[in-house]
């Protein structure tokens, strides 16, 4: 499948609109501080060059690799060293080291101002004046803040965004139409971002084998009627394109994703009965739809797993002859029977099975040793089931905000050295698991809860890696991805932590808090709760509830007062004093 010109090949496959969008995303993810206008200039230059290569594939430089072409573009920016410092050192390297160097400099937490959505009228004016520029800004702003965002999926979200604007800008009350729709889109995009970051982390840290195992498990749950060869083919293709996107090879990734969708739609009969509705859609919607498609119905009369994986005398022989294939078959067979398990749990079970075979196949009578392996899975299954039950009960009792606060206390006690904004972000996101998963039917809860939590904890790990402060977090983050959630759940209160000394200014508030939207008000209160726990890590639940209650009452009172600032100045110190007394 060799092409004389890689860039011409991708331009023709993707079409100009998607090509330009992907190049913009790529540049924005690598150079996260550059303004939109600078990136657009580069995108236009690359697009013009691609068009010359389409016209004549033998034209000068058209035979160069995409890494070389894109890298040369980035390295030609005159202000590169001033803006990016040591990232400019990458330019002294040759490919493929240069691209690896760019990847290492991607920043998961760039120092960028939070993105503030303009008011609806202003947005509609901008959109109607120039929809392409408006959507370009969206791609740029999301990509630079989320340097591992799944590029073809970001194009899908941009399409959704555009459709919302087209629909709402014709309405009388534009804001009423736009706000809830964009809020929902933002939630989905943020979830997509953390899920993709987990995939990239898994590939970066543990390589293709680990990611492929994840893909086999997930695909087997979704497509239980497909045979093992079909699942292996899909998992291999998904691994390849995910690696491309994580590696910044966005044109190849998007092209391969479209190819995979095409293949799935052409082979529905051997994959799943649920694909038809997705396959009728255009390319971006089709791929998105396939990625979210519901699990197919289980085939009737699936035999017991024990026959092939426990009772068969050939287990060790099969394992010795083709270790990865045999374990892959085990994972496939287990996963297709258990759509009610999380992928993380399925991978832990496969790991347990592998460890059992490693131990037992070395013995003189292996079958006597591995004969009870399926029974030994029971504690591994019970642990996340109990976690889901306990946390969903807590969520139902406290509601989302209260549940988030319980998690703030829990996680601050586990890792009090972690920065307050990171703890608030993590606990708020972990708390969303309630409204996202606990409302689902019983059989869907466990996969929803554990796989969502795994993605959120990966975000914690990625941020912590940048500035490691907690030994407990490092311990959980450096282990295997599938063991992270149980590791964090099992973390005790960090007894090595020396409580933070009390600073009155940390708990001093002003009238400006009153004008904040409810969500931001909550975050301020939650930041104060983190600080309280850092000050008094051994504070009890009732003590903290008392202080938080008083704090909420104080805010309500002062925000209703005639002279708000005077109220804050007068009652603030009283609140600080009573809080200290309550926690003494």
């Amino acid at each position: 499948d060799a092409h004389k010109s890689e860039i011409a090949h991708r331009f023709k496959d993707l079409g100009e609109q998607h090509f330009k969008g992907l190049v913009l995303i790529a540049f924005s993810q690598f150079l996260q501080k550059c303004p939109y206008e600078e990136h657009v200039k580069l995108v236009n230059e690359v697009t013009d060059f691609a068009k010359t290569c389409v016209a004549d594939e033998s034209a000068e430089n058209c035979d160069k690799s995409l890494h070389t072409l894109f890298g040369d573009k980035l390295c030609a920016i005159p202000t590169l060293r001033d803006s990016y410092g040591e990232l400019a050192d990458c330019c002294a390297k040759k490919e493929p080291e240069r691209n690896e160097c760019f990847l290492k400099h991607k920043d998961d937490h760039p120092n960028l101002p939070p993105f503030v959505r303009p008011d609806a009228e202003a947005m509609c004016t901008s959109f109607q004046e120039n929809a392409v520029t408006f959507m370009g800004h969206y791609l740029h702003e999301v990509a630079r803040r989320h340097p591992y965002f799944y590029a073809p999926e970001l194009l899908y979200y941009a399409e959704k965004y555009s459709a919302i604007m087209t629909e709402c800008c014709g309405e009388a009350d534009k804001a009423a139409c736009i706000t809830p729709k964009l809020d929902a889109l933002k939630e989905k995009a943020l979830a997509s971002s953390v899920n993709q970051r987990l995939k990239c982390s898994s590939l970066q840290r543990f390589g293709q084998r680990a990611f492929k195992a994840w893909a086999v498990a997930r695909m087997s749950q979704k497509f239980p009627k497909a045979d093992f060869a079909e699942i292996t083919k899909l998992a291999t293709d998904l691994t390849k394109l995910t690696e491309e996107c994580c590696h910044g090879d966005l044109l190849e990734c998007a092209d391969d994703r479209a190819e995979l969708a095409k293949y799935m739609c052409e082979n529905q009969a051997s994959i799943s009965s649920k694909l038809q509705a997705c396959c009728d859609k255009p390319v971006l919607k089709k791929s998105h739809c396939l990625s979210e498609v519901e699990n197919d119905d289980l085939p009737a009369d699936l035999p017991s797993l024990a026959a092939d994986f426990v009772e068969d005398k050939e287990v060790c022989k099969n394992y010795a002859e083709a270790k990865d294939v045999f374990l892959g078959t085990f994972l496939y067979e287990y996963a297709r029977r258990h759509p009610d398990y999380s992928v993380a749990l399925l991978l832990r079970l496969a790991k347990k099975y592998e460890a059992t075979l490693e131990k037992c196949c070395a013995e003189a009578d292996p079958s006597a040793c591995y004969g009870k392996v399926l029974d030994e899975f029971q504690p591994l299954v019970e642990e996340p089931k109990n976690l889901v039950k306990a946390n969903c009960e807590l969520f139902e009792k406290l509601g989302e905000y209260g549940f988030q606060n319980a998690l703030i206390v829990r996680y601050t006690q586990k890792a009090p050295q972690v920065s307050t904004p990171t703890l608030v972000e993590a606990a708020r996101n972990l708390g969303k698991v309630g409204s996202k998963c606990c409302v689902l039917p019983e059989a869907q809860r466990l996969p929803c809860v554990e796989d969502y939590i795994s993605a959120i904890l990966n975000r914690v790990c990625v941020l912590h890696e940048k500035t490691p402060v907690s030994e407990q977090v490092t311990k959980c983050c450096t282990g295997s991805v599938v063991e992270r959630r149980p590791c964090f759940s099992a973390l005790p209160v960090d007894e090595t932590y020396v409580p933070k000394e009390f600073k009155a200014e940390t708990f001093t508030f002003h009238a400006d808090i009153c004008s904040l939207p409810e969500k931001e008000k909550q975050m301020k209160k939650q930041a104060a709760l983190v600080e309280l726990v850092k000050h008094k890590p051994k504070a009890t639940g009732p003590q903290l509830r008392t202080v938080l209650g008083e704090f909420t009452a104080f805010l309500d009172k002062c925000c209703k007062a005639e002279d708000k600032e005077a109220c804050f100045s007068e009652d603030g110190p009283k609140l600080v004093a009573s809080s200290q007394a309550a926690l003494a």
């Epitope: 005398k313 060790c316 022989k317 010795a320 490693e358 196949c361 070395a362 013995e363 003189a364």
Partner: nanobody, 115 residues
């Protein structure tokens, strides 16, 4: 590609001895328990003896206990079966297998005990 090559069989008189060898390749021999099985004419496969990966644990069928000794040399990827005090009923094709398998993978080696 897993390969198991048995050798050392032959014709021997009752009470005589033979030493069978099995050379293994295509897998990490030192990590797997190994087994000797045999198949007499017109009979099913019979498990004879097993040994752990390190050679520190051995098992024998009652019919061969005290007469046969299983051993291995992981440096040479080779499994052995020392057969003493052979009896006519030991006549069979002998196979080595991986980890308790009763499914002969190699060609086997013929042992005939007859006067």
């Amino acid at each position: 590609q897993v390969q198991l090559q048995e050798s050392g069989g032959g014709l021997v008189q009752p009470g005589g001895s033979l030493r069978l060898s099995c050379e293994a390749s295509g897998f990490t021999f030192s990590r797997f328990g190994m087994t000797w099985v045999r198949q007499a004419p017109g009979k099913g496969v019979e498990w004879v003896s097993g040994i752990s990966s390190l050679g520190d644990s051995t098992l024998y069928a009652d019919s061969v206990k005290g007469r046969f000794t299983i051993s291995r040399d992981n440096a040479k990827n080779t499994l052995y079966l020392q057969m003493n005090s052979l009896k006519p009923e030991d006549t069979a094709v002998y196979y080595c297998t991986i980890g308790g398998s009763l499914n002969p993978g190699g060609q086997g080696t013929q042992v005939t005990v007859s006067s």
